[in-house]
């Protein structure tokens, strides 16, 4: 299992361990879900589900999610809240993850060009942490410059990747357009021909990044969309096989799947679509929208079912003097959201064949 190939078996893993985890996943045809966390509660829900499923997990903070982690009352001028929130989330996850006994990849999600000051802030924190501990604060980061030209996208990634590689840090990048909207990137009206990344584009990324370090993954577009999308989705995960083949032929390597790929915009996808992606080298699947809704359902159902017990601090159907503290205590109703979000993650771990891989 996974634990055999990791130097650090539990808690936040970095460097070679991240590379070995993704290599193992690719070889054994499973993918690791990446859960967007916005609070200690959502982080705990993900960690608990992964622990109970004997699975590794990726916890990631988006730009907006990081700002929320810091607190909605803080100004995000100069990406201040997003930087502080991401760092706070990282320290929180680093301190609590070992208690769950599973390997955790600590990641930051989509960073568009206009959000690069956020990336700079996280990277500075990584470098400071590296000086002190010999490893970066985060396991990995994502740059999403898919709105820019390929040339600018790749050159910006190269610039940052050189800094990251010095800390043996993983980079996820995106090329081609994933429809819908994500922090700072809105591709809802993208030209149809742009919804499928071309193999040549993917190879250009490989050619630029691989000489720096093998620690990178590519989110290529195959008709997928962020969020729940009402448009005419034509998901073609089998296209990822073309990317693997083209890069393999260009490089002349024997490895069947030289690329580490990422599945974005998976809400509403079928099990078979996920499996096709995973069989073709997908090692990470982003889960956000589905988890957000799952988290809500537990709280929603609790509030609806306990309506008569939460209308006032005292007084319920059992009597006018009966206290309602045990019903309105946040630890009770927030926990319900954790349970339903955890159940969704448990199901996803099964779908992605991650269950029992430790």
């Amino acid at each position: 299992g996974v634990e055999q190939i990791l130097k650090r078996k539990t808690g936040v893993i970095v460097g070679e361990d991240v590379h070995n985890l993704f290599t193992y996943a690719k070889e054994h045809k499973f993918a690791i879900p990446a859960i967007n966390v916005t609070s200690s509660s959502t982080a705990v829900a993900a960690l608990e589900a992964a622990r109970d499923s004997k699975s590794p997990i990726i916890l990631q903070t988006s730009n907006g999610g990081a700002a929320y982690f810091a607190g909605k009352g803080i100004s995000n001028e100069g990406q201040n809240a997003s930087i502080k929130g991401a760092i706070a989330a990282a320290h929180y996850i680093r301190s609590i993850a070992p208690a769950y006994g599973i390997p955790v990849v600590l990641h930051s999600d989509h960073c568009a060009k206009k959000l690069l000051p956020w990336f700079d802030g996280m990277l500075e924190a990584d470098e400071a942490y590296f000086k002190e501990h010999g490893e970066p604060l985060f396991s990995s980061h994502m740059l999403d410059l898919s709105e820019e030209t390929d040339e600018e996208n790749i050159s910006t990634c190269v610039k940052y990747f050189k800094r990251m590689a010095a800390m043996d840090q993983w980079l996820e990048m995106e090329i081609g357009i994933t429809g819908g909207e994500e922090d700072g990137v809105n591709n809802e009206n993208a030209d149809k021909e742009d919804l499928y990344t071309k193999p040549e584009q993917v190879y250009n990324v490989y050619k630029a990044l691989h000489p720096i370090s093998p620690n990178f993954s590519i989110a290529a577009a195959f008709g997928n969309c962020h969020g729940l999308y009402a448009g005419d989705i034509a998901l073609r995960p089998e296209i990822l096989a073309e990317h693997q083949k083209y890069t393999r032929e260009q490089v002349g390597c024997k490895e069947e799947k030289p690329l580490f790929l990422v599945f974005h915009g998976g809400s509403g996808s079928t099990v078979q679509e996920f499996h096709t992606g995973i069989d073709n080298g997908v090692v990470k699947v982003n889960l956000d929208t589905d988890c957000q809704y799952a988290y809500l359902t537990g709280i929603r159902d609790y509030v609806l079912n306990k309506k008569d017990y939460i209308m006032s601090p005292v007084g319920n159907p059992e009597g006018p003097e009966k206290p309602n503290k045990k019903f309105f205590d946040p630890r009770v109703w927030v926990r319900e959201g954790e349970k339903t979000m955890g159940a969704k993650i448990t199901k996803s771990l099964e779908t992605f064949r991650t269950t029992n891989t430790l």
Epitope: E193, D232, I239, A241, E242, Q244, K245
Partner: nanobody, 119 residues
Framework: QVQLVESGGGLVQTGGSLRLSCAAS????????MGWFRQASGKEREFLAR????????FYADSVKGRFTISRDNAKNTVYLQMNSLKPEDTAVYYC????????????WGQGTQVTVSS
């Protein structure tokens, strides 16, 4: 637009095999995703299988996975559907379709070929 003509249909017994062919005309064949669909009498059109432009990637409907195999020969501008272990419920008109990489879904369709599986 790619023009498509299917062939290879016919009458076959349960458990038998058939190989359908779809000949495409048009210079863009090697940059298309090709697919097979079917429509049984009184039913909606059903997706069966897809294949990427070089043939590196395939995708199958659960109903035919393991029994049907899609392949293509770009030198001959032809896509195939090998159908094994046929059942009476496979009886339908089988259609070939093409999706250009600048299109969001299949947009070119053949006229279809009838497959009848007798018990």
């Amino acid at each position: 637009q790619v023009q498509l003509v299917e062939s290879g249909g016919g009458l076959v017994q349960t458990g038998g095999s058939l190989r359908l062919s779809c000949a495409a005309s048009g210079r863009t064949f090697s940059r298309t995703i090709m697919g097979w669909f079917r429509q049984a009498s009184g039913k909606e059109r059903e997706f069966l299988a897809r294949i990427t432009w070089s043939g590196a990637g395939t995708f199958y409907a659960d109903s035919v996975k393991g029994r049907f195999t899609i392949s293509r020969d770009n030198a001959k501008n032809t896509v195939y559907l090998q159908m094994n272990s046929l059942k009476p419920e496979d009886t339908a008109v089988y259609y070939c379709a093409a999706q250009g990489l600048d299109q969001r879904d299949f947009s070119s369709w053949g006229q279809g070929t009838q497959v009848t599986v007798s018990s």
